[in-house]
């Protein structure tokens, strides 16, 4: 947020930049927070976009059967391992098909044991405040997914008939990390010293963060011809004199004719 | 990357043999899988003889005792002789090979193909 500044009086300004504003030779560079040509207004809103979207990933064990463990294996950038990883991706797509949020699986280890594959599923969705839920009845629908085709897909006298066969007592959920977003956190964190008077109001499902000088939203102070400004014990009303009125009051609602007070009588609207 | 080529495909009578052979590139022969697969007209892709590294092999139980599966390291080639053909053994057969160690029927599972030999069984 800048303000550009033309004249003798700029060197003045220079070193009056407030609130850690730095002076770039024509104005105060402010800070994300402060604004004005001092950098003395704090702002009204903050941008804490949400993320467009939020992840989830499951760290799972899987034994597959119809695969005979070799050391290559182990190997990452063997061919023995690039197949196996093939197969196995192919296999996953088919298994987790119906879930919206599934990106894809990230095999991070093949062991010994018939061959064990440690990997991660990859969940995925659009950011709404319901992020959480719609994530963990993904991760359910996985691990019943994952249940059902390692307890169906099995070898009948050593030979499977499927893309893969499991060791239907070889599947575990290890652990489940989901993208933590607080908007409300994020708001006061970024409000700094004025954390106590910024909230979060949403609009169309997206996350605002607002102190009540923001006008429009159910917590805005209306300092009707006045002006809102933030300082550090909370939002006040600036009230304005015009040629004809005084105002004031805390939300500059009372009005006083100038007329009235020179002929000394004071008269409210 | 593994490249397959069959030969030995033809029309036969009932009753009568043929050997088909499968040339293979690639320095991957003597490890993972190999097999034959086919294809008949209107039908899915089935698995008629596997052969893995480890020794284990596998028949279709249509064609046991009359199909045998072997291979020449040396010459990289993997075979198919089928011998008393029947009518119901017309299709197209391909060989297939993984350098895993499958123990899988199934073709999805398999990573390289060659492009087929037909084989017709007709009086």
């Known amino acids: 947020r800048t303000t550009t500044c033309f004249g003798d009086g700029c060197q003045n300004t220079a070193s009056r930049c407030k609130n850690g504003g730095t002076w770039d030779g024509l104005k105060c560079q402010c800070p994300n927070l402060y604004y004005g040509e001092l950098c003395e207004e704090v702002v009204s809103s903050i941008d804490i976009g949400p993320p467009e979207t939020i992840s989830a990933q499951m760290e799972l064990t899987v034994t597959v059967t119809s695969v005979k463990f070799t050391e290559e294996l182990k190997n990452h950038s063997s061919q023995e391992f690039q197949e196996f990883k093939q197969t196995f991706t192919e296999q996953m797509n088919i298994v987790y098909s119906g879930i919206p949020e599934y990106v894809g699986v990230n095999i991070t280890k093949l062991r010994l044991g018939s061959v064990v594959v440690e990997h991660d599923v990859l969940l995925r969705t659009k950011y709404t405040p319901e992020y959480k839920t719609v994530l963990d009845n993904a991760t359910e629908v996985v691990k019943e997914k994952i249940t059902k085709v390692t307890t169906q897909q099995i070898m009948i006298n050593d030979i499977c008939s499927d893309m893969m066969c499991f060791n239907t007592t070889g599947t575990q959920v290890q652990n489940i990390t989901v993208t933590q977003y607080d908007p409300e956190e994020d708001c006061r964190k970024m409000a700094k010293e004025y954390g106590d008077y910024f909230v979060v109001e949403y609009r169309d499902q997206k996350p605002y963060c607002i102190s009540p000088c923001e006008p429009g939203f159910s917590v805005s102070k209306n300092c009707n011809l006045g002006k809102c400004q933030m300082s550090l014990s909370g939002p006040q009303c600036l009230c304005v004199t015009t040629e004809t009125h005084w105002y004031s009051g805390e939300t500059c609602n009372q009005g006083t004719q100038k007329s009235l007070v020179y002929g000394h009588h004071h008269h409210h609207h | 990357e593994v490249q397959l080529v069959e030969s030995g495909g033809g029309v036969v009578q009932p009753g009568g043999s043929l050997r088909l052979s499968c040339a293979a590139s690639g320095d991957t022969f003597s490890r993972g899988s190999w097999g034959w697969f086919r294809q008949a007209p209107g039908k899915e892709r089935e698995a008629v003889a596997l052969i893995s590294s480890d020794g284990w092999t596998f028949y279709a139980d249509s064609v046991k005792g009359r199909f045998t599966i072997s291979q020449d390291n040396s010459k990289n080639t993997l075979y198919l002789q089928m011998n008393s053909l029947r009518a119901e053994d017309t299709a197209v057969y391909y060989c297939?090979?993984?350098?895993?160690?499958?123990?899988?029927?199934?073709?999805?599972?398999?990573?390289?193909w060659g492009q087929g030999t037909m084989v017709t069984v007709s009086s």
């Open positions: 297939a090979a993984s350098v895993l160690v499958l123990r899988t029927l199934n073709p999805k599972a398999w990573h390289h």
